[in-house]
Every structure is written in structure tokens, then in C-alpha cells.
Amino acid sequence: MAVTACQGLGFVVSLIGIAGIIAATCMDQWSTQDLYNNPVTAVFNYQGLWRSCVRESSGFTECRGYFTLLGLPAMLQAVRALMIVGIVLGAIGLLVSIFALKCIRIGSMEDSAKANMTLTSGIMFIVSGLCAIAGVSVFANMLVTNFWMSTANMYTGMGGMVQTVQTRYTFGAALFVGWVAGGLTLIGGVMMCIACRGLAPEETNYKAVSYHASGHSVAYKPGGFKASTGFGSNTKNKKIYDGGARTEDEVQSYPSKHDYV
């Protein structure tokens, strides 16, 4: 029972985590304009992995995709790759873990096969979570570096008369979503790996022991009077019921190019 609960919980936690990783990857707020120097700006900039956006105080939001691949920073490409790898691994892990769930019966699948599948999905979730955490952390590090660089040359004056303020960017909501989601996927993966240990059938062979009683030549098999109780042919002791795998349609909404707030 505890094994089933651990496996089920691991699956649910991982599912939430992977949904979060997908959401974070699609989000536009990976970096947002730092408002420390101008908290009442009429133009607010924010950037994602795929496009950069500008929200005017008028309510108009304009987003422009990064239509170049070669012109993008290598770090951004690396973050994209890490997040995509994380999503792909997580998605495969989810698929594998659905079939590995103890509460779902597929044909005459052995517990050993389910244990292996649980372990495989668990490892996939762990790697997926690590990819997401790594991707988000690389991006955060890039932001911190750029932040202090732009702070160093925040104002460049033209003869001390005209000020040109350089836009600084700070952590966006997507980073926090990514960190939490990556952590959840990681925890879910660990739970799956723990569940795997409980799912693996015991390898101990219980050999029949002969007890010679005086005057009788009767061999007693451990397990009592019924051969099928406990240790007999029915060693699996399966809990059987049909658990339907549910799939939820996730709709990712994007701000339109003419989005009045």
C-alpha cells in the first residue's frame, strides 16, 4: 500500500513539475525590466526564451520573436536546449511511469518489469528536473552578470548634458516557476526510485524443509495448510483494478499584439 502511494504521489508530483517546466519554457517573463531607478516607467520591457515584449502604460503589448538562430547568445541557446531536453525526458518519463503504475494493470506484466519501468521513469524525472534547474540557473547567472555590467555603466553622458539610461533586467516570474517545477520533478523522480525498491519482488527462495516426526513420514511445507496461502504459487498478491489514465488538454495563452489591459 505504501509503495503504491509513494509511486502514485511521485507520478503526480512529477506531472505537476513537468507541467511547470513546460509553462516556464513558454513564459515571456524570464527577465523583466528592473524598476529600481524608475518605478513609474511608462514602458515596461520583459524577455523570454523565444521572444521579447514591451508593455506600454497605455495597455498595448508588443512582442517580437527572436527570428534569428545564429545571432542569439550561446547561453540563451544552451538554456533553450536544457529546457527542451528537460521537457522531452519528462514527457517520456511520464509515459513510462503511466504503464509502471501499480494501480494500472496491463496484460500480465510482471512486478519486476513494473519496478524497472518505475526506476527508468524516476531517473528520467531526476534528469529532467536537473536540466530545468540547470537551465534556469544558467539564465539567472547570465542576468546577474549583465545586471552588474549595466550598473557599472548605467549612465553615459554626452558632455554631462544628456543622460542615456541603460535598461537593466532582473529575475522574471518564469525563473521562479522553473526552479520550483524543476525541484518538484526532481522530488517526484526520487519518490519513483524509492517506490521501485518496494515494487521489486523478493529474491529469497523459501525451500521446503522436511521435519521427520517419529512414526510418521510427512513433509510439511512452510505456509500452513493451504499451498496457495502466502508463499504458494500466488506469490504476487496483486491488487487488481482498472485505473484509467487521464489526459488534460493544456492551453497556453499568449498576450496578443494588440492586448489592451
Partner: antibody, heavy 118, light 113 residues
């Protein structure tokens, strides 16, 4: 057709109060940020206050902060400017304006004159 | 606050002439996020409210004659009227649309001979 009509102007004594209204029609009022802008022959155009479509954020010019309050009633398509502790320098023609692309004002009302004098 | 300076204050021209109105800001109005300049031009005729001519420094508002052209970037901007007509006699204002408080220039009064 987009229309903005201001009302509530008039002669006020220094230290007195006045509430200006701006009735909007011809567009989805709840979808736009709105402003009050004033004009005097001496100072020219001066931005006074801004209110976003959902009433937050709200911004004021330093000259009116703490004395003026901008508000809106979306179901009634009306913008307000509550003016208190009025000074002679607040004497101006007050316009309401609709916020548009590029943080510009694409439609203005005809204005309402507020005169602060003893 | 961003200070907007317009020059000249007064301008008298002949109909059909090309006119250039200047506007300078104390701080750059160029937004790095979308590479747009947040500067707006308005025209105000006597007894009327201001009318929007150009936003984003060079985008002409619908219904505005194409003789009106906005240009410039960063801190220096110009409004050009290619061939002045009698109905262009008005006050022209530039506005900082980049940060609050939204500030206006002192205006340029265009007169016709």
C-alpha cells in the same frame, strides 16, 4: 465615434474643492487607460494624472500629488478628478485624454475651465 | 523628470514652404526593448484641444496628411511639414511618452504670411 465630454469646471476659492467629470462614449471605456491634462497660457500643456483601465496603477504629477484624486466608474463610462486644497496656480483648462499606442493621447475632450480666485 | 525643449518658439512661413520643427529631450526616449522612440507630436489649433499627429517618433496617426513626417532618435527629434498649407497654422507640441511624469515641450507656434 469616440467622444469625451468634460464637466464640473467653474470658479473656486483658494483652498476650495471641485470634482471634474469626463463622460466617455463611442469606445470600450474599460479597455483604456485615461488621463487628465491641463493647459495654461503661461505653462502650456501639463500632464496631471493617469489611471489604468482597472484603476491600478495610478500616477500623479508632483504638483498635484496629495491634493488631487483620479478615479473612474467603468460601468458608467466616466472618469473623475477630485481636486482639493486648490491654489491659484491650478487655474487652467482641464482636458481628459484617452491613452493610446506609444503612450500618446489619441482623443481629447473639449476641456472644462477651472478658475481658482478669491 | 524629462525636460522637453522645442525650437523655435515662433515660426512664420509662406504656404507651400517646407518647415522643420525641432524637439530635444533631456534623456533618451529610445526604448531598447523594441527599438522605438517614445516621442509624440500634437497639433493644437486655437480654441480646440490638441490633436495627435505622430507617435513612436515617426508613426503617423490615421487621418493625418502625409505631408507631416516625424523623424529622429534618442534625444533629437524633428517634425517636418513638406508643404505648409493654410490649415497648418497652429501650435505644435512634442511629448515625452517614455516615463512618468509625461512631459510636454513648450510648443512651436506656426504662423503663415
Amino acid at each position: 465615434d469616440v467622444q469625451l465630454v468634460e464637466s464640473g469646471g467653474g470658479l473656486v476659492q483658494p483652498g476650495g474643492s471641485r470634482k471634474l467629470s469626463c463622460a466617455a462614449s463611442g469606445f470600450t471605456f474599460s479597455g483604456f487607460g485615461m488621463h487628465w491634462i491641463r493647459q495654461t497660457p503661461e505653462k502650456g500643456l501639463e500632464w496631471v494624472a493617469y489611471i489604468s483601465s482597472d484603476s491600478r496603477p495610478i500616477y500623479y504629477a508632483d504638483t498635484v500629488k496629495g491634493r488631487f484624486t483620479i478615479s473612474r466608474d467603468n460601468p458608467k463610462n466616466t472618469l473623475f478628478l477630485q481636486m482639493t486644497s486648490l491654489r491659484s496656480e491650478d487655474t487652467a483648462m482641464y482636458f481628459c485624454g484617452r491613452f493610446y499606442y506609444g503612450n500618446s493621447f489619441d482623443h481629447w475632450g473639449q476641456g472644462t475651465l477651472v478658475t481658482v480666485s478669491a | 523628470d524629462i525636460v522637453m525643449t522645442q525650437s523655435p518658439s515662433f515660426l512664420t512661413v509662406t504656404a507651400g514652404e517646407k518647415v522643420t520643427l525641432s524637439c530635444r529631450s533631456s534623456q533618451s526616449l529610445l526604448n531598447s526593448g523594441n527599438q522605438r522612440n517614445y516621442l509624440t507630436w500634437y497639433q493644437q489649433k486655437p480654441g480646440q484641444p490638441p490633436k495627435l499627429l505622430i507617435y513612436w517618433a515617426s508613426t503617423r496617426e490615421s487621418g493625418v496628411p502625409d505631408r507631416f513626417t516625424g523623424s529622429g532618435s534618442g534625444t533629437d527629434f524633428t517634425l517636418t511639414i513638406s508643404s505648409v498649407q493654410a490649415e497648418d497654422r497652429a501650435l505644435y507640441y512634442c511629448q515625452n511618452a517614455y516615463s512618468f511624469p509625461l512631459t510636454f515641450g513648450t510648443g512651436t507656434k506656426l504662423e503663415l504670411r
